[in-house]
């Protein structure tokens, strides 16, 4: 039978390549049984994770899983870094793996796009 503990399904060592100026939604997949836990986002600064208090967040509910979303509108160059979501559940703190955002500043983007950029943004080949 399925565990009724809260589980946060951010993949270990996951990464996202994003462009400054674009909107972006960072998802924290959350599994819970009865009551939706209180979830927060933080940004890693060395070994400490600084809570993101004043950022826009929202929930997206799907059939078997929910997503706690951190909104970047737009992405800024200093959004580069590693993020983690945490859930408070029955006075336990559950922490996700961290996920890393690699922000490319359009103004300083190198002339040669990466393989990932070419796959997700074929128009980069023709700029």
């Amino acid at each position: 039978k399925e565990s009724c503990d809260v589980q946060l399904y951010i993949k270990r060592q996951s990464e996202h390549s994003i462009l400054a100026g674009d909107p972006f939604e960072l998802e924290c997949p959350v599994k819970y049984c009865a009551n939706r836990p209180h979830v927060t986002w933080c940004k890693l600064n060395g070994t400490t994770c600084v809570k993101l208090e004043d950022r826009q967040t929202s929930w997206k509910e799907e059939k078997n899983i929910s997503f706690f979303i951190l909104h970047f509108e737009p992405v800024l160059p200093n959004d580069n870094g590693s993020y983690r979501c945490s859930a408070n559940f029955q006075s336990n703190l559950i922490e996700s793996h961290s996920t890393t955002l690699y922000v490319t500043d359009v103004k300083s983007a190198s002339e040669r796009p990466s393989k990932d950029e070419m796959a997700s943004r074929p128009w980069l080949l023709y700029r």
């Epitope: 399904y9 993949k11 270990r12 060592q13 996951s14 990464e15 996202h16 390549s17 070994t47 793996h97 393989k115 990932d116 796959a119 997700s120």
Partner: antibody
């Protein structure tokens, strides 16, 4: 049941390219990582790279960066490995492997049966 | 790259006797989440590799308890308490924390 079904053996000419496929069943590749590994005849295992099919983000061993391109199609639950400018050094068996799984222990747990690539003129 | 050094290269063991394989990494495999990402797999002749042990000591489902994994940091060991005929093949350790992922050179277990 979790399975990774790889495409059939390939015999290719030097200088050509080849694209291998790895179709998953029993799980959604979007939820996990897919890795590709190389094993030359009677040799050890070499890690080529991995893809996060949820966002297409890849990581490669630098020595395969210009040789290999890993992609994924979540609609068909399939990952691909394209090898370019083939030489005899690329003659090997290539394995796709899942990393992730239901308990998220992050150790490659399910392996495809391997695809043999022979480069010969 | 993290170098994974496996010894011995070949292990010739009588059925029923114990066997031990060492794996040393050039960097610590302890991650910030407190887990150590050292894994062992077995490749039987003519087959794909199969996961045997993950996170140093956790046995994959279906793996008999005569196998044990131990170690920490950079020094790890796989032990088989009583070797059986089905244990023949090549054993690899590999690390799952640093990129690129790297493997030991393999230890071939054969029956004496």
């Amino acid at each position: 049941e979790v399975q990774l079904q790889q495409s059939g053996a390939e015999l290719v000419r030097p200088g050509a390219s080849v694209k291998l496929s790895c179709t998953a069943s029993g799980f959604n590749i979007r939820d996990d990582y897919v890795h590709w590994l190389k094993q030359r005849p009677d040799q050890g295992l070499e890690w080529i790279g991995r893809i996060d099919p949820a966002n297409g983000k890849t990581k490669y061993d630098p020595k395969f960066q210009d040789k290999a391109t890993i992609t994924a199609d979540t609609s068909s639950n399939t990952a691909y490995l394209q090898l370019s400018s083939l030489t005899s050094e690329d003659t090997a068996v290539y394995f796709c492997v899942r990393e992730g799984g239901s308990n998220y222990d992050y150790a490659m747990d399910y392996w495809g049966q391997g695809t043999s690539v022979t480069v010969s003129s | 790259d993290v170098v994974m050094t496996q010894t011995p290269l070949t292990l010739s063991v009588t059925i029923g006797q114990p066997a031990s394989i060492s794996c040393k990494s050039s960097l610590s495999l302890l991650d910030s989440d407190g887990k150590t990402y050292l894994n062992w797999l077995l490749q039987r002749p003519g087959q794909s590799p199969k996961r045997l042990i993950y996170l140093v000591s956790k046995l994959d489902s279906g793996v008999p308890d005569r196998f044990t994994g131990s170690g920490s940091g950079t020094d790890f060991t796989l032990k088989i308490s009583r070797v059986e005929a089905e244990d023949v093949g090549v054993y690899y350790c590999w690390q799952g924390i640093h990129f690129p992922r790297t493997f030991g050179g393999g230890t071939k277990l054969e029956i004496k």
